[in-house]
């Protein structure tokens, strides 16, 4: 379970891929679409509100609650809308929702090299937000091989 209902901290940051493509959000037909694209130099990057939460890590061997914690984030590009994992469709979608947020809106934060991060689905361990065909998608990662895969690495810049 997530510790408390209030986030530890929040930060506003733009999200880009390992290859410096921007993650952008556009309102189309009363719903938001998520794009992965090269931004023109003069275009401002979209910002995302990251809210950080602390939770117990379920695979803790000790089981005493002392060992085994993880950081989770929710990502909100605009008021009342949050990124959510759709595990059935292997997609990442923006949904309007009220608090308390559903588990699909929580992602375990992983720090990688070069200050890149990865987002692992709370609801589906081993599945990460990734880039596929210029869209965000859910990508199953083989821990022994692809944890450093560029398509699940993102840069946060404030």
């Amino acid at each position: 379970s997530i510790t408390g209902i209030s986030p530890i901290t929040e930060s506003l940051a733009s999200l880009s891929t390992y290859n410096d493509q921007s993650i952008t959000f556009a309102l189309e037909d009363e719903s938001y679409e998520i794009y992965v694209e090269d931004l023109k130099k003069d275009k401002k990057k979209d910002k995302v509100l990251l809210s950080y939460y602390e939770s117990q890590h379920p695979s803790s061997e000790s089981g005493d609650g002392v060992d085994g914690k993880m950081l989770m984030v929710t990502l909100s590009p605009t008021k009342d809308f949050w990124l959510q994992a759709n595990n059935k469709e292997h997609s990442v979608e923006l949904h309007k929702c009220e608090k308390p947020l559903p588990d699909q809106a929580f992602f375990v934060l992983h720090n990688r090299s070069f200050n890149c991060v990865s987002f692992e689905c709370k609801t589906d361990p081993g599945v990460f937000i990734g880039v596929k065909d210029n869209h965000l998608a859910l990508i199953k990662v083989d821990y022994s091989e692809n944890l450093g895969s560029e398509n699940i690495l993102f840069k946060l810049s404030e």
Epitope: T9, G68, L109, E145, L147
Partner: antibody, heavy 122, light 107 residues
Framework: QVQLQQSGNDLVKPGASVKLSCKAS????????INWIKQRPGQGLEWIGR????????SYNELFKDKATLTVDTSSSTAYIQLGSLSSEDSAVYFC???????????????WGQGTLVTVSA | DIQMNQSPSSLSASLGDTITITCHAS??????LSWYQQKPGNIPKLLIY???TLHTGVPSRFNGSGSGTGFTLTISSLQPEDIATYYC?????????FGAGTKLEVK
């Protein structure tokens, strides 16, 4: 309980290399990154790098990229650091440390090995 | 790289005193700051993470505060076992960096 047991102190000659070990117990070894930290006598702490035991994925401090090589053996829950082309500047205590958070370095280092003193001397 | 400027480098205080150590980050690190205590010949011990959260088993006389770029470690009612060197460390971005340390001595 979580424990990190490091190999014994080492006296090595300039120009040689040395491999230090850090055996983990009391938790799921593949779930948490292992970090290596250097402390020269009477000095502060320097972060060398970190390795994800589950994947072997590594992140180095650029200052140590040509000096240190990090590896793991998941079958024995052991992390290793190899230090090459040793000089007197490398004489220090080397600590392994497990991160507080699963997957993330934001929370610092909750558990530390006892340290291995490496002395470089002719 | 984020620089961590810790002060003072040394501090002399009497038992029972309240002491304050500060740490300044060269850029915003939100709450991703940890404090460690290291006694001579011993390993560093995590005292505080997330700027203000006490690690398990750490006495409540230790208090961490701050966010952004300015952080403080306060030890109230100084005890003999608190004599040590204290380090701050930022966890916001790689490479992870430490303050130079504050050596706490008894008057």
């Amino acid at each position: 309980q979580v424990q990190l047991q490091q190999s014994g102190n080492d006296l090595v000659k300039p120009g040689a290399s040395v491999k230090l070990s850090c055996k983990a117990s009391g938790y799921t070894f593949t779930s948490y990154w292992i970090n290596w930290i250097k402390q020269r006598p009477g000095q502060g702490l320097e972060w060398i790098g970190r390795i994800a035991p589950g994947s072997g994925f590594i992140s180095y401090n650029e200052l140590f990229k040509d000096k240190a090589t990090l590896t793991v053996d998941t079958s024995s829950s052991t992390a290793y650091i190899q230090l090459g082309s040793l000089s007197s500047e490398d004489s220090a205590v080397y600590f392994c440390a497990r991160e507080f958070y699963y997957g993330s370095f934001y929370g610092g280092f909750a558990y530390w090995g006892q340290g291995t003193l490496v002395t470089v001397s002719a | 790289d984020i620089q961590m400027n810790q002060s003072p480098s040394s501090l002399s205080a009497s038992l029972g005193d309240t002491i304050t150590i500060t740490c300044h980050a060269s850029q915003n690190i939100h709450v991703w700051l940890s404090w460690y205590q290291q006694k001579p010949g011993n390993i560093p011990k995590l005292l505080i993470y997330k700027a203000s959260t006490l690690h398990t088993g750490v006495p409540s006389r230790f208090n961490g505060s701050g966010s952004g770029t300015g952080f403080t470690l306060t030890i109230s009612s100084l005890q003999p076992e608190d004599i040590a060197t204290y380090y701050c460390q930022q966890g916001q971005s790689s490479p992870l960096t430490f303050g130079a340390g504050t050596k706490l001595e008894v008057k």
